[in-house]
């Protein structure tokens, strides 16, 4: 089976790398525009220059192209705790990230939120906090992990997952109560 190619890919594959086929005349290959520029006018004929113009402020192209418009620069989303790591330039989009001691959680492919790295109070750091992953904590005896925090087994209800981890403590508490009645 022949893989399906989009119209643009089909047109581009007829010309050598770095060139694209003229939309009105498929016998002409025009040179693509450099990153940081966009296509203003197609080349008038073979061996003639493509009319490329620099992207305006607030827009960019990150690779060679024959786009009719530059792409809009991304904005860092303050409500998600994002901060700007580097500003948008004509040939590179804005880079957004998180503050120190925070990590990114991706809700979707193109949306992340910044959260504070867990400190592992009442536990130890098993894996340090990374750019896209929270600290992995191991809890001390008498504590269990809930929402990546070490919580005292005294807060463990029978219906929760913690019963397995806290079982010795729960039995201990019962034992102490029983011994107190004699």
């Amino acid at each position: 089976l022949v893989p399906h190619l989009g119209d643009r890919e089909k047109r581009d594959s007829v010309c050598p790398q770095g060139k694209y086929i003229h939309p009105q005349n498929n016998s002409i290959c025009c040179t693509k525009c450099h990153k940081g520029t966009y296509l203003y006018n197609d080349c008038p004929g073979p061996g003639q220059d493509t009319d490329c113009r620099e992207c305006e402020s607030g827009s960019f192209t990150a690779s060679e192209n024959h786009l009719r418009h530059c792409l809009s620069c991304s904005k860092c989303r303050k409500e998600m705790g994002q901060v700007e790591i580097s500003s948008c330039t004509v040939d590179r989009d804005t880079v957004c990230g998180c503050r120190k001691n925070q990590y990114r959680h991706y809700w979707s492919e193109n949306l992340f939120q910044c959260f504070n790295c867990s400190l592992c109070l009442n536990g130890t750091v098993h894996l340090s906090c990374q750019e896209k992953q929270n600290t992995v904590c191991t809890c001390h005896a008498g504590f269990f992990l809930r929402e990546n925090e070490c919580v005292s087994c005294s807060n463990c209800k029978k219906s929760l997952e913690c019963t397995k981890l806290c079982l010795p403590q729960i039995e201990n508490v019962k034992g102490t109560e029983d011994s107190g009645t004699t």
Partner: nanobody, 119 residues
């Protein structure tokens, strides 16, 4: 106590429209970023859209961009989702939620409203 109550779901034909509402109480609605998420049958939660407190620069998932519009009325403590050009793949239970603060889990969300897109 935080309460979120979605309404407006129903059965609609492909290409049709629906407007979902979410009535909020128990917190200062005007200070919070609000979120719409959805869960299609047998699938995980999908982030659909969110809107900051001032209503400016909302976010849309690529799958709904240009078709859905999120809005809010802070005087009525109500969040909306206008859904146009509906497709079969938009069939899901839609939930409104508060943007999480402590960690990557949703603490507060409503009971959901079912949207079915079918001919």
């Amino acid at each position: 106590e935080v309460q979120l109550w979605e309404s407006g779901g129903g059965l609609v034909q492909p290409g049709g429209s629906l407007r979902l509402s979410c009535a909020a109480s128990g917190f200062t609605f005007a200070h919070e970023t609000m979120v719409w998420v959805r869960q299609a049958p047998g699938k995980g939660l999908e982030w659909v859209s969110h809107i900051p407190p001032d209503g400016q620069d909302p976010f849309y998932a690529d799958s709904v961009k240009g078709r859905f519009t999120i809005s809010r009325d802070n005087s009525k403590n109500t969040l909306y989702l206008q859904m146009n050009s509906l497709r079969a793949e938009d069939t899901a239970v839609y939930y409104c939620a508060l943007l999480p603060k402590r960690g990557p889990w949703i603490d507060y969300w409503g009971q959901g409203t079912l949207v079915t897109v079918s001919s």
